[in-house]
C-alpha cells in the first residue's frame, strides 16, 4: 500500500497540482475521481480538475507528489499533543518512551545476537563443504571460479570474515596467490551482502514497505555486482589491486600490533556463546586440505585445554624423515625420533546448549538457522512496530529532516560523503557490514531513511568492513601479517574503486535505479524476491562454477553466447526506452516474445497456483499471532496480516473474525502496483504468492 | 633372576619348517621388545627378528620376510618364531635376546644360550 | 642397509695391555652404537649402549667413546677373561646390524 506522501516545500509549478490524463492521483477516501482518457497519445489533454479534496492554497502551501511510490511515507501522529497532557500523563508518557526505548535496545539487541547465530548456523549446514571449495586447484587459474567461489563460500557461511581468514591462511602457507585471491575476495564481498537481502524479505507482509526495504538491501547487492562487473576484468588485465596493495605493504615496515577491538561483540558475546561455539579452524584446515579436519566437528565442545610443549618419541616411516642424526634411534621394530609435539588436555567444556548434546554439524545447524530466523522475523517485525510507534509526528519530521536532508548550497555534494564516513564509522563500531546494513533495512522500510540516503550508508559500510579486515590484519602474527594486510588492502581498493565508479557523479549512481527496479518488481510479484535471491547467490555461481569445472571451452562456450544475448537484450531496452523509432516497428517493444518471456504476470499464475493451498493456513496462523499479540500489548490496533490475508478474509469479517487493522500510517484506499500505477486493489490479481 | 631359555630347534629338510620357542623368567615379560638374533657356525651375530611388548609390532630382516612369523604369549611369558621355506643359509645357533621397553634404542641385554637349527638334505 | 665394519678382524695382546677397537659406520648413527663379548659356545653379552654408558655389572675397564662413524671400544687394561670376540651393533636404523666381529686372543 503506498502512503501519504510527506509535505514538502511549496513548488511553482501549478500543473503538478492538477488532474490530467498523463498525472496519476490517488483515490481518496470519499470521493472518486474522473480520470480523462484518449485513444490518441500524440493529442495533449487540455481537460483539468482541480483535485476536490484540497483547497488551492492548501496545495500550493504543500504540494502532494503522489506518483512517486518512493516517497516516503508521513507517519503522523495520533496521540495526544505533550502541551495537552496532565502531569499524570506527561510522566507516564516518559515512562512509556523509556519503555519503548529499552524494548527497541533489547530487539535490536537480539536482532544482531540472532544474525551471528545464524552465520554460525549457516557455517555448521554448509561450513565444510564450503571449505572444500577452497581446495579446488583450478582457482588458481581461473578468476571467475575464484569470484564464485567467494560467493558461495560466504553465503553459505554468511560470514565474509570467516571466507577472508581462510583466504589470508591459504595465501600465507602459499597454497594460493594473492593474484589468486583477489577474486574470491571480490566473491566475498557480493555475498555479504545476502544478508541484509534476507532481511529484507522479512518485511514482505506490507507492499510499500516492502518496496522500500528490499530495494534498500539490493542496492547493496548491485552496487558489488556491477563492481565486480568493472574491476574483475580491469584487475585480471592489469592486476592494479595486487601492484597496488605490494607498494603500500613493502613501503612500510609494519610491526603486528594488538588484536583488533571487539566492540559490539563485547555485548554479543556473552549471549551467543550460551547458544553455540563453533571452531573456525575447521573450516581453513578443510581448505588447506587437512584431510583429518574433514572428520571434526565445528561446535565447540572444549573451551579451556592446556597446551604442553613436551619432547616425544615419536615414530617415523624413514631414516629421511628424522629432525637430526642424533635424534633418530631404532628400536629394532620402528624407527623413533625426539619431536617437540603440543600436548593439548581438555581441562573445562564450553557452556553452551549443545556441548553435551553429541549431534552431528548438520542437526545443530538446521536447528539453529530455524531458531535464529524466527528470533531475526520476529525482532524486525516488533523492532518495525515500536519504531512506528515512536517515530511519527514531530519525532518522525526531526529525524527524516535530520537523515535525509542535505547540506545547503553549495556544499550539498558533500552530505552523501559525509553518510559514507557515518557508514564506515557506524561499521567499525559493530564490526560487521551485515549487521549494519541488516539494521538499515527497517529504517528504509518503514521510510525514515530514503535509499538514495541509505546508498552512501551502505558503500561506508563496505568501507568500515574492510578498515576493520586492515586492524585485524595489522594485529595477525609475523607469519600471516604480510598476506593479510595485502589482501585487507585489496578489498579496501577495491571498495574504493567501485564507489569511484558508481557515486560521485549521480548518473553514474546505477545501482540505486536498479534496486527500485527490482524493488517495483518484488513489490508486485513477492515470489520474484525469494527468486532473485536463489537465482543470484545461488544458481548463478554454482552454474558457473559448474562450468569452470568442466574447463575453459565449456565456460566459454555456455557464456559468450550468454553475455552476448544479455547485452543484445540490453542494448535493445535501451533504444526502446531512449529513441524507439530507430527500431522496426516489431522491436519497439517485447510484445513479439511469448507473454512468458517478457511479463512476470504468467509464471505469477503458475506460483499462486502452488502457493495458493498453502495461503490460507498461514493467514489463520498470522491471525490467531495477531490476535494473541493484541491481546498481550492491550491495543486492538497493534497487529496486522499481509494484504493477502485481507482478502482471503473478506467473506469471513460478517462471522466477527479480526482482519488488518490499519495502522495510522497506512493509506488504505491506495495499493501501488508498481512504480507510476494507482488503481483500487483488485483482490484477485494482488494477493501473489508471498 | 632374568633367563631365557630357547627350544625347538632340530635339523630340518630344505622347504621344511620348524618352530622355536623361548621361554623368560625373572623380568615382566609383557614390558619389554623381544628378538630373535641368530648366528651361522663361524660368523657373525646377525639380527633376524623383533616384537613389540604387546605383539602389536613386528620386524623382520629382508632375507627371511614372508616366510618366518614372530609372536608371543604374554601371559605365558614366551616367545616363537615360526621358520618356514627353511634354506641352507637359515642354518645357524638362534638366540632369544630381550630389548629395553618400547621406544627404547636397541640394546639386546639378556641372551637365552640357543637353540641350533640345522637345514640340509 | 647400515654396514658396521670392525677393525682388526683378529688381535693379539698380552694381559695388562691397553686394547683399542674401533667400529665404522657406513653413515652418521648419532651415538646409537652398543659393544658385545662372546665367548666361544656361549651366547653374547651387553658392554656398552649407546656409544658410551657403561652396561650394569661390567668392569669399568671397558670404556666406550665415539660418535656419528667411527667408534672405539678400549680396554684400559687386559684381564684374562677379557679374551673374547667383541661386535659392535648400531641401533640408529632398521634393520640392525652388527659388525663382523674381532676376536682379541692371548700374544
Known amino acids: 500500500m503506498a502512503p501519504w506522501p510527506e509535505l514538502g516545500d511549496a513548488q511553482p509549478n501549478p500543473s503538478k497540482y492538477l488532474e490530467g490524463a498523463t498525472s496519476q492521483q490517488p483515490i481518496t477516501p470519499d470521493k472518486s475521481k474522473e480520470t480523462n482518457k484518449t485513444d490518441n497519445t500524440e493529442v495533449p489533454v487540455t481537460k483539468f480538475e482541480l483535485l476536490p479534496t484540497y483547497s488551492t492554497a492548501t496545495l500550493i502551501e504543500e504540494p502532494t507528489e503522489v506518483d512517486d511510490p518512493w516517497n516516503l511515507p508521513t507517519l503522523q501522529d495520533s496521540g495526544i499533543k505533550w502541551s495537552e497532557r496532565d502531569a499524570k500523563g506527561k510522566i507516564l508518557c516518559v515512562f512509556q518512551g523509556i519503555g519503548r526505548l529499552i524494548l527497541l535496545l533489547g530487539f535490536l539487541y537480539f536482532f544482531v545476537c540472532s544474525l551471528d547465530v545464524l552465520s554460525s548456523a549457516f557455517q555448521l549446514v554448509g561450513g565444510k563443504m564450503a571449505g572444500q571449495f577452497f581446495s579446488n586447484s583450478s582457482i588458481m587459474s581461473n578468476p571467475l571460479l575464484g569470484l564464485v567461489i567467494g560467493v558461495l563460500v560466504t553465503v553459505f557461511v554468511q560470514s565474509s570474515s570467516t571466507s577472508t581468514s581462510i583466504v589470508v591462511s591459504m595465501v600465507a602457507s602459499s597454497l594460493l596467490t594473492v593474484r589468486a585471491a583477489i577474486p574470491i575476495i571480490m566473491g566475498a564481498n557480493i555475498g555479504t551482502s545476502i544478508t541484509n537481502t534476507i532481511v529484507a524479505l522479512m518485511q514482505v507482509g506490507d507492499r510499500s514497505e516492502f518496496r522500500r526495504a528490499f530495494a534498500g538491501a539490493t542496492v547493496h547487492d548491485f552496487f558489488n555486482w556491477l563492481s565486480v562487473l568493472v574491476l574483475l576484468p580491469v584487475e585480471v588485465a592489469t592486476h592494479y589491486l595486487e601492484v597496488v596493495t605490494q607498494l603500500i605493504v613493502e613501503s612500510f615496515h609494519f610491526k603486528n600490533g594488538e588484536d583488533a577491538p571487539d566492540l559490539l561483540k563485547v555485548i554479543t558475546k556473552p549471549f551467543t556463546k550460551l547458544i553455540v561455539q563453533l571452531d573456525k579452524k575447521v573450516i581453513s584446515q578443510i581448505a588447506m586440505n587437512d584431510e583429518t579436519a574433514k572428520n571434526k566437528s565445528l561446535v565447540k565442545i572444549w573451551c579451556k585445554t592446556f597446551t604442553n610443549m613436551t619432547q616425544m618419541n615419536v615414530t617415523v616411516p624413514s631414516m629421511a624423515n628424522c629432525t637430526s642424526h642424533s635424534l633418530c634411534w631404532t628400536d629394532g621394530i620402528q624407527i623413533w625420533t625426539m619431536k617437540n609435539v603440543t600436548y593439548k588436555e581438555n581441562i573445562a567444556k564450553c557452556q553452551h546448549i549443545f556441548v553435551n548434546f553429541h549431534l552431528p554439524d548438520l542437526a545443530v545447524g538446521i536447528i539453529l538457522l530455524i531458531i535464529s530466523l524466527l528470533v531475526l522475523c520476529g525482532c524486525l517485525i516488533m523492532i518495525v512496530k515500536i519504531l512506528g510507534s515512536v517515530l511519527k509526528g514531530q519525532v518522525a519530521t526531526v529525524i527524516k529532516k535530520t537523515i535525509n536532508t542535505d547540506f545547503p548550497f553549495p556544499f550539498a555534494w558533500l552530505t552523501g560523503y559525509l553518510a559514507i564516513l557515518v557508514g564506515a564509522g557506524m561499521t567499525f563500531i559493530v564490526q560487521s557490514s551485515s549487521v549494519f546494513t541488516s539494521a538499515l533495512t527497517p529504517l528504509i522500510g518503514i521510510g525514515v531513511i530514503t535509499i538514495e540516503r541509505a546508498y552512501p550508508l551502505t558503500l561506508g559500510s563496505n568501507i568500515g568492513t574492510t578498515t576493520t579486515a586492515i586492524l585485524a590484519a595489522l594485529a595477525s602474527p609475523g607469519n600471516t601479517l604480510r598476506s593479510s594486510l595485502q589482501i585487507a588492502l585489496c578489498h579496501f581498493f577495491f571498495n574504493i574503486s567501485g564507489i569511484l565508479l558508481w557515486y560521485p557523479i549521480p548518473f553514474t549512481r546505477l545501482p540505486i535505479r536498479m534496486a527500485k527496479g527490482l524493488g517495483n518488481i518484488s513489490a508486485k510479484y513477492r515470489w520474484f524476491a525469494v527468486f532473485y535471491l536463489i537465482i543470484f547467490f545461488f544458481l548463478i555461481p554454482l552454474t558457473v562454477f559448474g562450468l569452470s569445472l568442466a574447463g575453459w571451452p565449456v565456460l566459454v562456450g555456455v557464456g559468450v553466447p550468454v553475455v552476448f544475448i544479455i547485452i543484445l537484450v540490453l542494448c535493445l531496452r535501451l533504444l526502446q526506452s531512449r529513441c524507439p523509432r530507430v527500431l522496426p516497428k516489431k522491436l519497439q517493444n517485447w510484445n513479439f516474445l511469448p507473454l512468458c518471456m517478457h511479463s512476470l504476470k504468467p509464471w505469477d499464475a503458475v506460483i499462486s497456483k502452488f502457493t495458493g493451498p498453502f495461503q490460507m493456513p498461514c493467514c489463520c496462523c498470522c491471525r490467531v499471532c495477531c490476535r494473541v499479540c493484541c491481546l498481550l500489548c492491550g491495543c486492538p490496533k497493534c497487529c496486522r496480516c499481509s494484504k493477502c490475508c485481507q482478502d482471503l478474509e473478506e467473506g469471513q469479517e460478517a462471522q466477527g473474525v479480526p482482519v488488518k487493522a490499519p495502522e495510522t500510517f497506512d493509506n488504505i484506499t491506495i495499493s501501488r502496483e508498481a512504480q507510476g500505477e494507482v488503481r483500487a486493489p483488485d483482490s484477485k490479481t494482488e494477493c501473489t504468492a508471498l | 633372576e632374568v633367563q631365557l631359555v630357547e627350544s625347538g630347534g632340530g635339523w630340518v629338510q630344505p622347504g621344511g619348517s620348524l618352530r622355536l620357542s623361548c621361554a623368560a623368567s625373572?623380568?615382566?615379560?609383557?614390558?619389554?621388545?623381544m628378538y630373535w638374533v641368530r648366528q651361522a657356525p663361524g660368523k657373525g651375530l646377525e639380527y633376524v627378528s623383533g616384537?613389540?611388548?604387546?605383539?602389536?609390532?613386528?620386524y623382520y630382516v629382508d632375507s627371511v620376510k614372508g616366510r618366518f612369523t614372530i609372536s608371543r604369549d604374554n601371559s605365558k611369558n614366551l616367545l616363537y618364531v615360526h621358520m618356514g621355506s627353511l634354506k641352507p643359509e637359515d642354518m645357524a645357533m638362534y638366540y632369544c635376546?630381550?630389548?629395553?621397553?618400547?621406544?627404547?634404542?636397541?640394546?639386546?641385554?639378556?641372551w637365552g644360550q640357543g637353540t641350533l637349527v640345522t637345514v640340509s638334505s | 642397509d647400515i654396514q658396521m665394519t670392525q677393525s682388526p678382524s683378529s688381535l693379539s695382546a698380552s694381559i695388562g695391555d691397553r686394547v683399542t677397537i674401533t667400529c665404522r659406520a657406513s653413515?652418521?648413527?648419532?651415538?646409537?652404537l652398543n659393544w658385545y663379548q662372546q665367548k666361544p659356545g656361549k651366547a653374547p653379552k651387553v658392554l656398552i649402549y649407546?656409544?658410551?654408558s657403561l652396561q650394569s655389572g661390567v668392569p669399568s675397564r671397558f670404556i666406550g667413546s665415539g660418535s656419528g662413524t667411527d667408534f672405539t671400544l678400549t680396554i684400559s687394561s687386559l684381564q684374562p677373561e677379557d679374551f673374547a670376540t667383541y661386535y659392535c651393533?648400531?641401533?640408529?636404523?632398521?634393520?640392525?646390524?652388527f659388525g663382523q666381529g674381532t676376536r682379541l686372543e692371548i700374544k
Open positions: 651393533q648400531q641401533s640408529y636404523s632398521v634393520p640392525i646390524t
Open positions: 625373572g623380568f615382566t615379560f609383557s614390558s619389554h621388545i
Open positions: 649407546v656409544a658410551s
Open positions: 653413515q652418521s648413527i648419532g651415538t646409537f
Open positions: 616384537i613389540s611388548s604387546n605383539g602389536l609390532s613386528s
Open positions: 635376546a630381550r630389548g629395553g621397553r618400547d621406544r627404547v634404542p636397541a640394546v639386546f641385554d639378556y
